[in-house]
Interface confidence: low
């Protein structure tokens, strides 16, 4: 039996994946639940099994096709339903008209690498993954650098207001270990949110030359 309120949130990665989280504050005991996606104007539908991520929330990924295939466009509407088994039938627990390009969350940037490092600066590049060609150059990035003795939460955010897949970090301390992360967000979409942070890239600045300030 299910009681209480629920929250059903989904994001489209702009290519072929819709990730959903369903939260339910009542108890769900030994109940099988799934998300069903039914596009209004396409010849496919898709289902994924909701798996627990905490005591009261479940998640699943709707895999719509090959990772880089463009499965939905800006005018698609996908009816998303949470269905939970009740005996021999399925009960609709939540429903939403999902507009993919209003609810975007891209994949985290990948292939971070140090292009050039000096004593006080470091040039880093990255790539975006599975991002739709519809965005053209309409993307922005946030980056952060982890300094020794600090946490990621304390790291100041650097904003790149254009599709720029590199950054030159300045005023770094020589011979110091740093970590760097970046995330991406399309400019499009009322409910669009930032991608997850990339995997951290560790790098070390060069030591200062003896008797010389470089």
């Amino acid at each position: 039996a299910v009681n209480g309120t629920s929250q059903f949130t989904c994001f489209y990665n702009s290519r072929a994946n819709i990730s959903c989280v369903w939260s339910q504050d009542g108890a769900l005991q030994d109940t099988s639940c799934q998300v069903h996606a039914w596009p209004d104007r396409r010849r496919w539908n898709q289902t994924c099994e909701l798996l627990p991520v905490s005591q009261a929330s479940w998640a699943c990924n709707l895999i719509l096709g090959a990772p880089d295939s463009q499965k939905l466009t800006t005018v698609d509407i996908v009816t998303l339903r949470v269905l939970c088994r009740e005996g021999v039938r399925w009960r609709v627990m939540a429903i939403q008209d999902f507009k993919p390009f209003e609810n975007l969350r891209l994949m985290a940037p990948i292939s971070l690498q140090v292009v050039h490092v000096e004593t006080h600066r470091c040039n880093i590049s990255w790539e975006i993954s599975q991002a739709s060609h519809y965005f053209e150059r309409h993307l922005e990035f946030e980056a952060r650098t982890l300094s020794p003795g600090h946490t990621w939460e304390e790291a100041p955010l650097l904003t790149l207001k254009q599709k720029q897949e590199w950054i030159c970090l300045e005023t770094l301390t020589p011979d110091t270990q740093y970590e760097f992360q970046v995330r991406v967000k399309p400019l499009q979409g009322e409910f669009t949110t930032w991608s997850p942070w990339s995997q951290p890239l560790a790098f070390r600045t060069k030591p200062a030359a003896l008797g010389k300030d470089t």
């Epitope: 039914w38 209004d40 104007r41 800006t74 509407i77 009816t79 008209d97």
Partner: antibody
Framework: EVQLLESGGGLVQPGGSLRLSCAAS????????VHWIRQAPGKGLEWLGV???????DYNAAFISRLTISKDNSKNTVYFQMNSLRAEDTAVYYC?????????????WGQGTLVTVSS | DIQMTQSPSSLSASVGDRVTITCQAS?????LYWYQQRPGKAPRLLIY???NLASGVPSRFSGSGSGTSYTFTISSLQPEDIATYYC?????????FGQGTKVEIK
């Protein structure tokens, strides 16, 4: 069999309002979007808006200030309301539904209802 | 809005003739549809997703194209094909139609 039946057309005064109904059968409006399209006499087709299965709407920006599309799921009926009518709104108004697992595009159309705006 | 421009606006051909209608979009579109509308009737879907024949549509109708340029063909015109034909894009709101091509029999 999928069927759409429009009603509510007729003569409307300039400046007045129009409320049309689209009764659906053979499918549920909780599973499919229903679109409204019009055709002025001797002219082409013009898309006005849609109400999706969950109740959200998309409108042609040219009509957004005076157009409301709603529905009653229990009656399996979609409603179209347009305000501040003028002579150029005289047209046959159609409701239509996209196809399903076989194809998309406007596969199903109502027979249309004629609205005449005149004093 | 994406403008859909059909040509010709009207044509007259003999039974058995091959008839071609073009549809030019003002910007690239992903999904293109063709409809037939006989006088006094609602439109009927003929072609979906550029080149696929809708259910129950005779094989003499076909469609092709990509980007901004699309073509609709009737390989052998029949008397029952007298109608107005419309293209329509479903890539960007508002959904838009071509102005129509009226096909008549000589």
């Amino acid at each position: 069999e999928v069927q759409l039946l429009e009603s509510g057309g007729g003569l409307v005064q300039p400046g007045g309002s129009l409320r049309l109904s689209c009764a659906a059968s053979g499918f549920s409006v909780t599973s499919y979007g229903v679109h409204w399209i019009r055709q002025a006499p001797g002219k082409g087709l013009e898309w006005l808006g849609v109400i999706w299965s969950g109740g959200s709407t998309d409108y042609n920006a040219a009509f957004i200030s005076r157009l409301t599309i709603s529905k009653d799921n229990s009656k399996n009926t979609v409603y179209f309301q347009m305000n501040s009518l003028r002579a150029e709104d005289t047209a046959v108004y159609y409701c239509a539904r996209a196809g399903d697992a076989n194809y998309d595009g406007f596969a199903y159309w109502g027979q249309g209802t004629l609205v005449t705006v005149s004093s | 809005d994406i403008q859909m421009t059909q040509s010709p606006s009207s044509l007259s051909a003999s039974v058995g003739d091959r008839v071609t209608i073009t549809c030019q979009a003002s910007q690239s579109v992903s999904f293109l549809y063709w409809y037939q509308q006989r006088p006094g009737k609602a439109p009927r879907l003929l072609i979906y997703d550029t080149s696929n024949l809708a259910s129950g549509v005779p094989s003499r109708f076909s469609g092709s194209g990509s980007g901004t340029s699309y073509t609709f063909t009737i390989s052998s015109l029949q008397p029952e094909d007298i109608a107005t034909y419309y293209c329509q894009q479903w890539s960007t709101y508002p959904l838009t139609f071509g102005q129509g091509t009226k096909v008549e029999i000589k």
